[in-house]
């Protein structure tokens, strides 16, 4: 991979340990927590990042679930099990043998159960809605300029192919970014929308995952765009399976 050779660091993931012990003395970086080798030319998977984060825990967060099939990360942080490719394993369990099924972004999509719970496949999150509220400004941002700036950001900072940014909606002060990526659309080497959304979420919170890069400085025609709250909704290719008790709660 293309980790910086001079000082051997991982530009796309500061939660790594790097050393020149790769083939031919090349810089090789491993994620904290899992020890898995990461490709520093692209985003690290959310599963490995969460695992690394749990090796230096911070406060969990809670979000609100808006509708029947849209999932929000209500459960906050947990120490996930990742497969050899760094993806979430379909079934996650905690230390007390409580288990649940997750989607490809690691968000719980079933009721919690015991060790007998089966999660047959990792269900893909194919549609992510990032809902932002920006701080008050003198006037509304120009919609086209705002739209282009956010699309540029996802291309340049997160390396997300432009075809996966489906839409940018704006009704001051609310901005919605829609990311869509079906299993059939995602080619080898494409950044996953779940990973891009996670990096963006951390950037917005001032917790950038990038090494040696400034924090996110969003500007629209030079005007700062300051986000005061973020909600992220996840839609899966197969609807989640929660009991009626939860749905009516």
């Amino acid at each position: 991979h293309t980790a910086a050779q001079d000082n051997c660091t991982c530009p796309t993931n500061k939660m790594t340990v790097c050393s020149p012990d790769g083939p031919g003395g090349r810089c090789q970086c491993r994620a904290l927590g899992s020890g898995m080798a990461v490709d520093c030319s692209t985003l690290t998977s959310k599963c490995l990042l969460l695992k690394a984060r749990m090796s230096a825990p911070k406060n969990a967060r809670t979000l609100v679930r808006p509708s029947e099939h849209a999932l929000v990360d209500n459960d906050g942080l947990y120490d996930p099990d990742c497969d050899p490719e760094g993806r979430f394993k379909a079934r996650q369990c905690n230390q007390t043998s409580v288990c649940w099924c997750v989607n490809s972004v690691g968000v719980r999509r079933t009721d919690k159960g015991d060790l007998s719970l089966r999660c047959d496949e990792l269900v893909r999150t194919h549609h992510i809605l990032i809902d932002l509220r920006h701080r008050p400004t003198a006037g509304a941002f120009n919609h086209s300029d705002l739209d282009a700036e956010l699309r540029r950001l996802f291309r340049e900072r997160y390396r997300l192919h432009p075809k996966f940014v489906a839409a940018v909606h704006y009704e001051q002060p609310t901005i919605q970014i829609e990311l869509r990526q079906n299993t059939s659309q995602k080619a080898a080497g494409d950044v996953d929308i779940g990973d891009a959304a996670y990096y963006f979420e951390r950037d917005i919170k001032g917790e950038s995952l990038f090494q040696g890069r400034g924090g996110l400085d969003l500007r629209v025609r030079g005007e700062p765009l300051q986000v005061e709250r973020t909600l992220i909704y996840y839609l899966d290719e197969i609807p989640p399976k929660f009991s009626m008790k939860r749905l009516t709660a």
């Epitope: 293309t2 030319s41 086209s144 282009a148 192919h161 839409a167 400034g214």
Partner: antibody
Framework: EVQLVQSGPEVKKPGASVKVSCKAS????????IGWVRQAPGQGLEWIGE????????YYTEKFKGRVTMTADTSTSTAYMELSSLRSEDTAVYYC??????????WGQGTLVTVSS | DIQLTQSPSSLSASVGDRVTITCSAS?????MYWYQQKPGKAPKLLIY???TLASGVPSRFSGSGSGTDFTLTISSLQPEDFATYYC?????????FGQGTKLEIK
């Protein structure tokens, strides 16, 4: 094979408009971005703006805002850049270039626009 | 706008020489891109993400740098390398190019 084929040279009078076309092939047109860059004779490269072909989202640089219009015809996989109120300093080669996770990965061959009275 | 200043503006060198072109940004950028342009032709992507060679680019080309200072190096000049080289950023709108470095045969 990715190709961007631009329209032929144009000679225009000051105050007139010019519309340069860029026909794309070898890739899914609406998945990408087309940027426009110009180069005055003997000078460097100057970015004009870009259009997201799937959504029609456009960004123009401040310098060209109000004078430039970028459009795309998805049925023919062709992008267009129209520049109005032409002046002599607009004489340049105009390039279209495809954007993806790179700003410009493939370029058209260029279209020479000459503005002369 | 982020200004990019290339140095030198022109350079005379011989086949086999090692050549270095620098690009200085007026404020920090994430990555630098480098293009090669030959007379009468469109620019060609040479290096992306500061140091990664574009497809088909010979290994004698290399890129490095971070923040505001970036470098393009040609380890051993070949006859086909005589051209104009441009750096470019897209860390913020508008995308900007350096003024170019013309590499001529001595």
């Amino acid at each position: 094979e990715v190709q961007l084929v631009q329209s032929g040279p144009e000679v225009k009078k000051p105050g007139a408009s010019v519309k340069v076309s860029c026909k794309a092939s070898g890739f899914t047109f609406t998945d990408y971005v087309i940027g426009w860059v110009r180069q005055a004779p003997g000078q460097g490269l100057e970015w004009i703006g870009e259009i997201y072909l799937g959504s029609g989202t456009i960004y123009y640089t401040e310098k060209f805002k109000g004078r430039v219009t970028m459009t795309a015809d998805t049925s023919t996989s062709t992008a267009y850049m129209e520049l109005s109120s032409l002046r002599s300093e607009d004489t340049a080669v105009y390039y279209c270039a495809r954007g993806s996770i790179f700003p410009f990965d493939y370029w058209g061959q260029g279209t020479l626009v000459t503005v002369s009275s | 706008d982020i200004q990019l200043t290339q140095s030198p503006s022109s350079l005379s060198a011989s086949v086999g020489d090692r050549v270095t072109i620098t690009c200085s940004a007026s404020s920090s950028v994430s990555y630098m891109y480098w293009y090669q342009q030959k007379p009468g032709k469109a620019p060609k992507l040479l290096i992306y993400d500061t140091s990664t060679l574009a497809s088909g680019v010979p290994s004698r080309f290399s890129g490095s740098g971070s923040g505001t200072d970036f470098t393009l190096t040609i380890s051993s000049l070949q006859p086909e390398d005589f051209a104009t080289y441009y750096c470019q950023q897209w860390s913020s709108y508008p995308y900007t190019f350096g003024q170019g470095t013309k590499l001529e045969i001595k």
